[in-house]
């Protein structure tokens, strides 16, 4: 029998044909892949069918953030009987098929990662001709992106009662912690923000009142490294009189 | 069966240029990546350029050794690849071998006979 | 850049005895389990030919006395029972991060 499950948009989540217990659909997935920004990574994912020795024409495809509905981040197609599954889109053309669909495995290459890429991953995969059938992940992989820290802005802003402050932004993962030195300041840890809303890798620390002109360093760190960024404060002095 | 055939090697003087061709059959061309690799007499392989395909829209890549003087290029039309060779030096001299590689993997599954190039004064 | 080291760099062995050549990686080249390990055989006057794909994967045609181990920074390619025809220079090759990089060869020839 046929067991096919339908969201409220309409769209096939999946299809369970049950001949006997070893011949059913499944994916396997490891819950976590770890990587650095600027490196590659791996998303493994292998899955077993019901439908023996298919060689029909087949569609492998992930997508990002959520199953089913996503963003598809890459789509390769084999013809009937072809172990070439061709690339028909790659996002920014970071996404490789390392796997081979016919032998069961849809495992993807990612190429110069990016913080961004921090996102879950789903792999999918449709039969198509005589037998039509498709296939997701409900839970796919987490793509962990670390990064050393990278200081992003840094900038000095007037205050009222002409004052002024300093603001450091970073990014990094594991989030960096940001420490301002100064004069007459030492190391101070001042008014961290951290992290921003909606920018889970950005980190801001705030020198709420600069009194002493000279450099400002911020300097933000993580397991992975540190780095550091200065700016200068030179206020203007007149002549009394 | 596929086939790939490279041809424009020669005698060219230090600091001049020469352009190699490499004419593929028997498959696809526009599915794959395509490389040049080169060895140079009885010495090992060297990979010297990779440019990718329409999808991955035509990237190229290059070893260090011959970044800025060689340009890897292709025509999908003529089923070509190219390799145009400046400023170039004794050190390379080599045999330049066409090879293809599939788009998820960079290893070289079929290559050609390899054309000869030769730089001396 | 990925510096590959092969040994030995040529090897004697006797027709239908073991032949084993390693490979060493200055780094790591496996990815979640993925091996981005490559091996080539080269015959004098010829291009190269794939033999192994990512370590352990038979490339399309090739005999299956040849076999690839390993993962991380050591590999190996075997040839169970050396052939008068398997007398060559044999290369492993990554494509773990570019450039691409070759080891430096090993030749294999009959005792």
């Known amino acids: 029998f046929v067991r096919t499950k339908i969201d409220t948009t309409e769209n096939l989540l999946n299809t369970e044909v049950h001949s006997s217990p070893a011949q059913r659909w499944s994916m396997q997935v490891p819950p976590e892949v770890s990587a650095e920004a600027g490196d590659a990574a791996v998303l493994p994912c292998t899955f077993t069918h019901p439908h023996r020795h298919y060689d029909g024409p087949l569609t492998a495809i992930w997508r990002a953030g959520e199953p089913y509905a996503g963003p598809q981040v890459f789509r390769c197609a084999a013809a009937r009987g072809s172990e070439l599954c061709q690339t028909a889109l790659s996002l920014h053309g970071r996404f490789r098929l390392l796997g081979n669909p016919r032998r069961n495995d849809l495992s993807l290459r990612v190429e110069r990662l990016a913080l961004a890429d921090d996102r879950r991953y789903f792999c999918r995969v449709e039969f198509a001709g005589d037998v039509h059938d498709r296939y997701e992940s409900r839970h796919g992989v987490r793509l962990h992106v670390t990064a050393a820290p990278r200081i992003v802005n840094i900038s000095v802003l007037p205050s009222p009662a002409h004052a002024f402050r300093a603001l450091c932004t970073a990014e990094g993962e594991p989030p960096p912690a940001l420490a301002w030195s100064g004069p007459a300041l030492g190391n101070s840890l001042a008014a961290v923000r951290s992290p921003r809303e909606g920018h889970g890798h950005l980190v801001t620390a705030e020198l709420p009142a600069l009194t002493h002109d000279g450099r400002y360093t911020c300097t933000a760190a993580n397991s992975l490294g540190r780095s550091e960024a200065s700016v200068y404060l030179f206020r203007f002095h007149g002549a009394s009189g | 069966e596929v086939q790939l055939v490279e041809s424009g090697g020669g005698l060219v003087q230090p600091g001049g240029s020469l352009r190699l061709s490499c004419a593929a059959s028997?498959?696809?061309?526009?599915?794959?990546?395509m490389n040049w690799v080169r060895q140079a007499p009885g010495k090992g392989l060297e990979w010297v350029a990779q440019?990718?395909?329409?999808?991955?829209?035509?990237?190229?890549f290059y070893a260090a050794s011959v970044k800025g003087r060689f340009t890897i290029s292709r025509d999908n039309a003529k089923n070509s690849l190219y390799l145009q060779m400046n400023s170039l030096r004794a050190e390379d001299t080599a045999v330049y071998y066409c090879?293809?590689?599939?788009?998820?993997?960079?290893?070289?599954?079929?290559w050609g006979q390899g054309t000869l190039v030769t730089v001396s004064s | 850049d990925i510096v590959l080291t092969q040994s030995p760099d040529s090897l004697a062995v006797s027709l239908g005895e073991r032949a084993t050549i390693n490979c060493r990686a200055s780094?790591?080249?496996?990815?979640?389990?993925?091996?981005?390990i490559h091996w080539y055989q080269q015959k004098p006057g010829q291009p190269p030919k794939l033999l192994i794909y990512r370590a352990s994967n038979l490339a399309s045609g090739i005999p299956a006395r040849f076999s690839g181990s390993g993962s991380g920074t050591d590999f190996t390619l075997t040839i169970s029972s050396l052939q008068a025809e398997d007398v060559a220079t044999y290369y492993c090759?990554?494509?773990?991060?570019?450039?691409?990089?070759f080891g430096q060869g090993t030749k294999v020839e009959i005792k």
């Open positions: 090879a293809r590689s599939l788009t998820g993997g960079d290893y070289f599954d079929y």
């Open positions: 090759q990554q494509s773990r991060k570019s450039p691409w990089t």
């Open positions: 028997g498959f696809n061309f526009n599915d794959y990546f």
């Open positions: 440019i990718r395909n329409k999808i991955y829209t035509y990237a190229t």
């Open positions: 780094q790591s080249v496996t990815i979640s389990g993925y091996s981005f």
